[in-house]
Interface confidence: low
């Protein structure tokens, strides 16, 4: 398990904002947002990046395919960037993650996986802002 | 480049059963599921059922169910679909097809099953 | 089963033409439909997915839209290789059905 303690969560924000929500957001048009209840959270900005590492890259028994899809590719980008050593342990945990999966499949579920996405997306951005905010105070 | 190729033409008699076979290659043949799509002369296209090559867990279609059987050989990457019972209905071009979420991104070429007596 | 119900079943049209060609379930699916295009003797092809997303190599021409229950496809100038019939297909849950076809014909 990557830790992302170290990650320079101020770039990670800038290409979100700049280029992965817009993937996120195209992937989900013609979908309410009030189609799908978020149940997935996420505490704190490392916390966040587990969660969303962990929904965008491993195949779920419902959502198999959102690997290869553009926000995806773009957030493995970012991670790899600004996440020192990202890289090298995602090559180990693909394998094993390979090996384990399991996908008997009644339901899709990618749009529920994605919307939760957003949802700790928009939560990690939260989190950031709450960051700088008590930073601002400290200051003044 | 991904392929799929099945086996060739079989012309059966009602009550028989026929096997085709499907040989992927280019992509890594556990990673995504196979499905079988079938389509009756000048028909649409019908789904017959589903396997998952890296436990052979199988889905079938109710339709099918009790007549079909899908199988796998991981060391050759080769998906089969097999079909007993046959009626003159059965007769179609039967497609395997790859997918991770239900649709369909590469196709077999097809193959001609006759049922006739 | 979710039933879908496409039409036209056939249409005539020119190279030029824009053409569109509407797909509707029994039931919400939310954007979980996918479109094929068959010509005759050969396999079908993909063209979008999740309603709107163009697969690979797929001329831009073609573009899916709708959620729910009502969807389209359409191609905004009709080339002479897009003459076929185009099928769509849910992609929400067993069973995946499909719509019976469209079949697009030289006017």
């Known amino acids: 398990m990557y830790d992302f303690t170290n990650c320079d969560f101020q770039k990670i924000e800038a290409d979100y904002l700049r280029t992965i929500s817009k993937d996120l957001i195209t992937y989900m048009s013609g979908t309410k947002s009030t189609d799908f209840n978020n149940t997935v959270s996420c505490s704190n900005r490392p916390h966040c990046l587990t969660e969303i590492q962990s929904l965008t890259f491993n195949p779920t028994p419902r959502c198999a395919s959102l690997a290869k899809e553009m926000f995806a590719r773009k957030t493995k980008a970012t991670l790899a960037l600004w996440c020192p050593g990202y890289s090298e342990t995602q090559i180990n945990a693909t394998q094993a993650m390979k090996k384990r999966r399991k996908r008997k499949v009644t339901t899709n579920k990618c749009l529920e996986q994605v919307s939760q996405l957003l949802g700790l997306w928009r939560r990690f951005i939260r989190t950031l802002l709450k960051k700088q905010l008590e930073h601002h105070h400290h200051h003044h | 480049q991904v392929q799929l190729v099945q086996s060739g033409a079989e012309v059966k008699k009602p009550g028989a059963s026929v096997k085709v076979s499907c040989k992927a290659s280019g992509y890594t043949f556990t990673t995504y599921w196979m499905h079988w799509v079938r389509q009756a002369p000048g028909q649409g296209l019908e789904w017959m059922g589903v396997?998952?090559?890296?436990?052979?867990?199988?889905t079938y279609n109710q339709k099918f169910k009790g007549r079909v059987t899908m199988t796998r050989d991981t060391s050759t990457s080769t998906v089969y679909m097999e079909l007993s019972s046959l009626r003159s209905e059965d007769t179609a071009v039967y497609y395997c097809?790859?997918?991770?979420?239900?649709?369909?991104?590469?196709w077999g070429q097809g193959t001609l099953v006759t049922v006739s007596s | 089963d979710i039933q879908m119900t496409q039409s036209p079943s056939s249409l005539s049209a020119s190279v030029g033409d824009r053409v569109t060609i509407t797909c509707r379930p029994t039931?919400?699916?939310?954007?979980?439909l996918a479109w094929y295009q068959q010509k005759p003797g050969k396999s079908p092809k993909l063209l979008i997915y999740f309603a709107r997303t163009l697969a690979e190599g797929v001329p831009s021409r073609f573009s899916g839209s709708g959620s729910g229950t009502d969807f389209t496809l359409t191609i905004s100038s009709l080339q002479p290789e897009d003459f076929a019939t185009y099928y769509c297909?849910?992609?929400?849950?067993?069973?995946?059905?499909f719509g019976g076809g469209t079949k697009v014909e030289i006017k």
């Open positions: 297909q849910h992609h929400y849950g067993t069973p995946w059905t």
């Open positions: 097809t790859r997918s991770l979420d239900g649709y369909y991104d590469y």
């Open positions: 396997i998952d090559p890296s436990d052979s867990d199988t």
């Open positions: 039931e919400n699916i939310y954007s979980y």
